[in-house]
Interface confidence: low
């Protein structure tokens, strides 16, 4: 008997053929002998199953000696024997209709699992191969499971239903929720606005939720929390904010955050987090600001960073178009009885500049300037 | 979002019938099997049958065969249920339900009172 | 027909107490390691109201206080914890066969 594949909530089309290459009587029924449609000169008559208004055929097709079953919106309780009954014969054709769904909803935070979930008809063993859109082969039975789901899982899983040596294949599109970037790292010097943004990694269309911003000042014992809004329709609205700092938030997406200045006594990690509507978890980006101060008092020249350096950080103190006077791994550094002239505090990684601030030392009998 | 609105209540004679109505909304009508429930006073629920409204068809618990029709009307998403011979037995409320993503029944209306007395 | 039969008929409970409701079946109403079996709660004057599906998946929009287990033919509902406005009349209900049959109902009052 022939075997047809078809994928819930499809249309298929079982094939009848008759010698005669004309409209001739047939019916299709099913495995307990329920008529489900036929003909009755060229009209199409049907018969009592559950298929009812979801069955057809193709009367264009008659004159030609075939009689099409089509079944619209399958189900899996759909798979049956199908028989087709024209010229005293029978043909049978075997439907079985399979399911794939992803566990609740194709919209996942990152870090969670996705599970695809295969629907089956009583009697059948398929096997179940799925590629990801970043070409990660999985295969499984009833269900498939990926857990710590990446941003890079993004996009169209295409998995692959074997039975019977025939195969369909589905199409999921999974959208990973998540920041574009799990960490950022904000360098200012003292007295700057610092600017924080927080892009998302997807698009949809309406986005609900509420978020809050968790400060740990490096100087503090304890985080705090700086700010906490609203985000409906991707319009945010600010529900709580501390008055130190005072921080300004953006109506629109992406979310976009405003320190009035940089003060060391800020410096620090930061943890946002945005709870989405209907989700169960949340996302989280790490922000760290790192503010640099530079000073003279009276016969000394300090330079000093706050917030969250690496150890490979060099800190470097030099007189402008010279050798630096002082260079350490270290958050301070200074320089006694510094030449008149203009000053350079260099923060940098592997050479490059990350945060540099200009000082001014002035004759011993002036005040420095810092510009 | 998902609406079943009944006719109201009737008041009927042994013998008479009652056709109870069910007009859905917020959802493509077809779709969706529509069923009925029966429950008598201070009882439990009991199914009287459903009907899938994009073709017709009917099925109805073997209890009630004999004595209910229930239609589907698609060009004004409304579906029927009609009792015929009525007993004073049958004085009860009548639901109509939709299932939701799930099995159970999601989606019910408010209910119509039918009270079967001489 | 599936029947089903529902203990205890009635229950009282104190407010934060656990509430735990049996349904019983006549036959398994196991389907593909699924069980078809739904609860309903329902208050006087309305239309019932469901909490779980499938035996165990919670509707939409219904507290996380509410829970659904079993397999097989034996299924319970449990409320914990309980709350004032859980007084109601709750059915269980077999989506697996036709005729589709509820329990008789357990009404459950809050002392």
């Known amino acids: 008997k022939k075997v047809v594949l078809g994928k819930k909530g499809d249309t298929v089309e079982l094939t009848c053929t008759a010698s005669q290459k004309k409209s001739i009587q047939f019916h299709w029924k099913n495995s307990n002998q329920i008529k489900i449609l036929g003909n009755q000169g060229s009209f199409l008559t049907k018969g009592p199953s559950k298929l009812n208004d979801r069955a057809d055929s193709r009367r264009s097709l008659w004159d030609q000696g075939n009689f099409p079953l089509i079944i619209k919106n399958l189900k899996i309780e759909d798979s049956d024997t199908y028989i087709c009954e024209v010229e005293d014969q029978k043909e049978e054709v075997q439907l079985l209709v399979f399911g794939l769904t992803a566990n609740s909803d194709t919209h996942l935070l990152q870090g969670q699992s996705l599970t695809l979930t295969l629907e089956s008809p009583p009697g059948s063993s398929p096997s179940v191969q799925c590629r990801s859109p970043r070409g990660k082969n999985i295969q499984g039975g009833k269900t498939l499971s990926v857990s710590q789901l990446e941003l890079q899982d993004s996009g169209t899983w295409t998995c692959t239903v074997l039975q019977n040596q025939k195969k369909v294949e589905f199409k999921i599109d999974i959208v990973v929720l998540a920041f574009q970037k799990a960490s950022s790292i904000v360098y200012k010097k003292e007295g700057e606005q610092v600017e924080f943004s927080f892009p998302l990694a997807f698009t949809v269309e309406k986005l609900t939720g509420s978020g809050e911003l968790w400060w740990q000042a490096e100087r503090a014992s304890s985080s705090k929390s700086w700010i906490t809004f609203d985000l409906k329709n991707k319009e945010v609205s600010v529900k709580r904010v501390t008055q130190d700092p005072k921080l300004q938030m953006g109506k629109k997406l992406p979310l976009h955050l405003t320190l009035p200045q940089a003060l060391p006594q800020y410096a620090g990690s930061g943890n946002l987090t945005l709870a989405l509507e209907a989700k169960t978890g949340k996302l989280h980006q790490e922000v760290n600001l790192v503010v640099m101060r530079a000073t003279q008092l009276q016969k000394n020249l300090t330079c000093e960073v706050w917030g969250p350096t690496s150890p490979k950080l060099m800190l470097s103190l030099k007189l402008e178009n010279k050798e630096a006077k002082v260079s350490k791994r270290e958050k301070a550094v200074w320089v006694l009885n510094p030449e008149a002239g203009m000053w350079q505090c260099l923060l940098s990684d592997s050479g490059q500049v990350l945060l540099e601030s200009n000082i001014k030392v002035l004759p011993t009998w002036s005040t420095p300037v810092q510009p | 979002q998902v609406q079943l609105v009944q006719s109201g209540a009737e008041v009927k004679k042994p013998g008479a019938s009652v056709k109870v109505s069910c007009k859905a909304s917020g959802y493509t009508f077809t779709d969706y099997v529509i069923h009925w429930v029966k429950q008598a006073t201070g009882q439990g629920l009991e199914w009287i049958g459903e009907i899938y409204p994009g073709s017709g068809s009917a099925y109805s618990n073997a209890k009630f065969k004999d004595r209910v029709t229930i239609t589907a009307d698609k060009s004004t998403n409304t579906a029927y249920m009609e009792l015929r011979s009525l007993r004073s037995d049958d004085t009860a409320v009548y639901f109509c339900?939709?299932?939701?993503?799930?099995?159970?029944?999601?989606?019910w209306g408010q209910g119509t009172l039918v009270t079967v007395s001489s | 027909d599936i029947v089903l039969t529902q203990s205890p008929a009635s229950l009282a409970v104190s407010p934060g107490q656990r509430a735990t409701i049996t349904c019983k079946a006549g036959q398994s109403v196991d389907y593909d390691g699924d069980s078809y079996m739904n609860w309903y709660q329902q208050k006087p004057g309305q239309p019932p109201k469901l909490l779980i599906y499938v035996a165990s998946n919670l509707e939409s929009g219904i507290p996380s206080r509410f829970s659904g287990s079993g397999s097989g033919t034996d299924f319970t509902l449990t409320i914990n914890p309980v709350e004032e406005n859980d007084t109601a009349t709750y059915y269980c209900q077999q989506s697996y066969k036709d005729p589709l049959a509820f329990g008789p109902g357990t009404k459950v009052e809050i002392k």
């Open positions: 339900a939709r299932r939701g993503n799930g099995t159970g029944f999601a989606y």
